[in-house]
Amino acid sequence: MKVLQEPTCVSDYMSISTCEWKMNGPTNCSTELRLLYQLVFLLSEAHTCIPENNGGAGCVCHLLMDDVVSADNYTLDLWAGQQLLWKGSFKPSEHVKPRAPGNLTVHTNVSDTLLLTWSNPYPPDNYLYNHLTYAVNIWSENDPADFRIYNVTYLEPSLRIAASTLKSGISYRARVRAWAQCYNTTWSEWSPSTKWHNSYREPFEQH
């Protein structure tokens, strides 16, 4: 049994880091493998993660962490029984994938303006809380070419757009994702999408 693709890990910079790797053949990850991880800090204990299958030869493990500070570094040991398959380390602050925003809501009752709001996925005392920026994706269910991205570079989790920038009388969907420049993170996953029917009063044409 050998590791084909070494574990790569990302952290949500809060409580979970996710490590993925591939074995050289079909593996029952949860019965055959264990990923041990330990914070490099005084008196820190080693913890064991039981991996799950992620495709035939792929494994994934969710490492629980009580909290994260940017100096933290973890040692990682991948074991198959008594055999050490791989040894490495992981610094969560250098591999951050933020949590996805939640509670995306489209408010259509503001005179010909669409107000999209969502929730910051972090509590106020987390470092990322004040460092997230967002991308909002809006698309038409009827027209695949009607697909747009709005970059929200301010901290407030909201976006206002004129309803007239979208077509009237058809349904749209929106979703939002986040990233943090300070830690050069990857983008989060997209939030669940929300749907609304876009309608607004067309201005009278002058003849």
């Epitope: 800090f41 005084l42 933290d72 005392d125």
Partner: antibody
Framework: EVQLVQSGAEVKKPGASVKVSCKAS????????MHWARQAPGQRLEWMGS????????SYNQKFKGRVTITVDKSASTAYMELSSLRSEDTAVYYC??????????????WGQGTLVTVSS | DIQMTQSPSSLSASVGDRVTITCRAS??????LIWYQQKPGKAPKLLVY???TLAEGVPSRFSGSGSGTDFTLTISSLQPEDFATYYC?????????FGGGTKVEIK
């Protein structure tokens, strides 16, 4: 806005004790370590100890050999530092400072204004 | 206890100068290092934590680097308000200890 407000200056005789208070506001008092440090005139800062108000766990600098006691009153969001058997070299400005939610996150973004304790016969 | 040694203990510099202050730990503290700025009669102000993370509201002319035992605080272009004393502190276990300070004075 996080604020730490300390009690006023004290003048004490050698051998006496002093108790300095630090009232916290603007955050959840029980969720962060509270530390005490001091600075004698022209000297480096010196960490004295800390307490986690959530459960009362304390950690002390052994240099003070049981002379320092840190307590909290959770209902008043106030931390206290008592130093006993005072000597002239204990003359210093004493600071409270809010630490992190966990030990290795103990940097001090918020400090009290400082309390001058003078020990003189 | 982990000893923190700063150098120089003082330096003279002019506005616009690049200033570098070093801090050495007596043993490996990984990246668990903090920098503070202190002005006379005031409490210290947090500048950098975890060796290189800039605290909220700190100007980008300040930067921290290093890991293990050797650390550096750099001010890329000294401003009038930067004349102060700078302290390092480790937070790799207790007791927390501070460096002796570096006083940055006007040349």
């Amino acid at each position: 806005e996080v604020q730490l407000v300390q009690s006023g200056a004290e003048v004490k005789k050698p051998g006496a004790s002093v108790k300095v208070s630090c009232k916290a506001s603007g955050y959840t008092f029980t969720s962060y370590n509270m530390h005490w440090a001091r600075q004698a005139p022209g000297q480096r800062l010196e960490w004295m100890g800390s307490i986690y108000p959530g459960n009362g766990d304390t950690s002390y600098n052994q240099k003070f050999k049981g002379r320092v006691t840190i307590t909290v009153d959770k209902s008043a969001s106030t931390a206290y530092m008592e130093l006993s058997s005072l000597r002239s070299e204990d003359t210093a400005v004493y600071y409270c400072a809010r630490g992190g939610r966990l030990r290795r996150g103990d940097w001090f973004a918020y400090w009290g204004q400082g309390t001058l304790v003078t020990v003189s016969s | 206890d982990i000893q923190m040694t700063q150098s120089p203990s003082s330096l003279s510099a002019s506005v616009g100068d690049r200033v570098t202050i070093t801090c050495r730990a007596s043993e490996n503290i990984y990246s668990y290092l903090i920098w503070y700025q202190q002005k006379p009669g005031k409490a210290p102000k947090l500048l950098v934590y975890d060796a290189k993370t800039l605290a909220e509201g700190v100007p980008s002319r300040f930067s921290g680097s290093g890991s293990g035992t050797d650390f550096t605080l750099t001010i890329s272009s000294l401003q009038p308000e930067d004349f102060a004393t700078y302290y390092c502190q480790h937070h790799y276990g207790t007791p927390l200890t501070f460096g002796g300070g570096t006083k940055v004075e006007i040349k």
